[in-house]
């Protein structure tokens, strides 16, 4: 369960890949599209509101082997829209929704080497937001391998 209904903290940051490509959001035909692209020098990076929540549960209840606290995050690039995992389509989408947010909008935050982070689906442990063909997608990571694969590493910068 997520401790409390309000985040412990929030921050505005731009999101980029391990290879320094920017994550951008564009309104097209009344819906938002997510792109992974090289930004022109003078173009301003899109900012995302990251809301951080504490999740507290015993491993027996969660089934993910974690027996304590985890840091959950939701990502909102524009008012009332949140990144959500579509596990059926293995895609990451922007949806307009009201609070309380659905579980698909929550991601477990992992700190990684090189000051990178990864985002693991709350609804599907072992599945992370990643980069595939210049788009964000859901990528299954084999826990027997090192989780350092570059396509699931992101950088946050204020």
């Amino acid at each position: 369960s997520i401790t409390g209904i309000s985040p412990i903290t929030e921050s505005l940051a731009s999101l980029s890949t391990y290879n320094d490509q920017s994550i951008t959001f564009a309104l097209e035909d009344e819906s938002y599209e997510i792109y992974v692209e090289d930004l022109k020098k003078d173009k301003k990076k899109d900012k995302v509101l990251l809301s951080y929540y504490e999740s507290q549960h015993p491993s027996s209840e969660s089934g993910d082997g974690v027996d304590g606290k985890m840091l959950m995050v939701t990502l909102s690039p524009t008012k009332d829209f949140w990144l959500q995992a579509n596990n059926k389509e293995h895609s990451v989408e922007l949806h307009k929704c009201e609070k309380p947010l659905p579980d698909q909008a929550f991601f477990v935050l992992h700190n990684r080497s090189f000051n990178c982070v990864s985002f693991e689906c709350k609804t599907d442990p072992g599945v992370f937001i990643g980069v595939k063909d210049n788009h964000l997608a859901l990528i299954k990571v084999d826990y027997s391998e090192n989780l350092g694969s570059e396509n699931i590493l992101f950088k946050l910068s204020e």
Epitope: A13, Y52, S59, G68, M70, L109, R112, L147, G148
Partner: antibody, heavy 122, light 107 residues
């Protein structure tokens, strides 16, 4: 309950190496990174580095790069910190510490070992 | 590396006093700041995380505030067991770095 048990005090000569162990219990070992922090006598706290017990990846403070090696043994839930080419300035208490949150160091370090005193003296 | 500057380095106070310790980061660290208490011969103890969240089991007389680069730890009414050294630590990026410490002594 969750605890970190460290190996005993060591006395080493300059130029030698020391290997300190930290045995974890009471939690899922691979879900939490392990950090090493040292404290010289009468001084403040100094972060040395971190190991991710899941894959074994490490991040070291620049100051210790090339002299420190952090490893782990998942079968015994033990993390090791080896410091080589010891000098008198390395005399300190060495702590292992676990983050408050699984997978993340953002919420601070809430479980600490009791510390291992390493004395470097000729 | 991010430098953490703590002040004052020591403070003399009496039981019941309000004590404030400040910590300044050389660059923005979002809200990722922790405060620790350390007593002689003991390991540090986490008091506050994410700038203002109280660690479980820590008395409510301890509070944290601030964001960006400037943070504060306040002890609203000092108790005998609070005489110790306090450290701030940025948890935003590697290498994690600590402030130099503030020793709270009996007046």
């Amino acid at each position: 309950q969750v605890q970190l048990v460290q190996s005993g005090a060591e006395v080493k000569k300059p130029g030698a190496s020391v290997k300190v162990s930290c045995k974890a219990s009471g939690y899922t070992f691979i879900s939490y990174g392990m950090h090493w922090v040292r404290q010289a006598p009468g001084q403040g706290l100094e972060w040395m580095g971190e190991i991710n017990p899941h894959g074994g990846s490490t991040s070291y403070a620049q100051k210790f790069q090339g002299r420190v090696t952090m490893t782990r043994d998942t079968s015994t839930s033990t993390v090791y910190m080896e410091l080589s080419s010891l000098r008198s300035e390395d005399t300190a208490v060495y702590y292992c510490a676990r983050p408050s949150a699984a997978y993340s160091h953002y919420l601070g370090l809430d479980i600490w070992g009791r510390g291992t005193l390493v004395t470097v003296s000729s | 590396d991010i430098q953490m500057t703590q002040s004052p380095s020591s403070v003399s106070a009496s039981v019941g006093d309000r004590v404030t310790i400040t910590c300044r980061a050389s660059q923005g660290i979002s809200p990722w700041l922790a405060w620790y208490q350390q007593k002689p011969g003991k390991a540090p103890k986490l008091l506050i995380y994410a700038g203002s969240s109280l660690q479980s089991g820590v008395p409510s007389r301890f509070s944290g505030s601030g964001s960006g680069t400037d943070f504060t730890l306040t002890i609203s009414s000092l108790q005998p067991e609070d005489f110790a050294t306090y450290y701030c630590q940025q948890a935003n990026v590697f290498p994690l770095t600590f402030g130099g410490g503030t020793k709270v002594e009996i007046k």
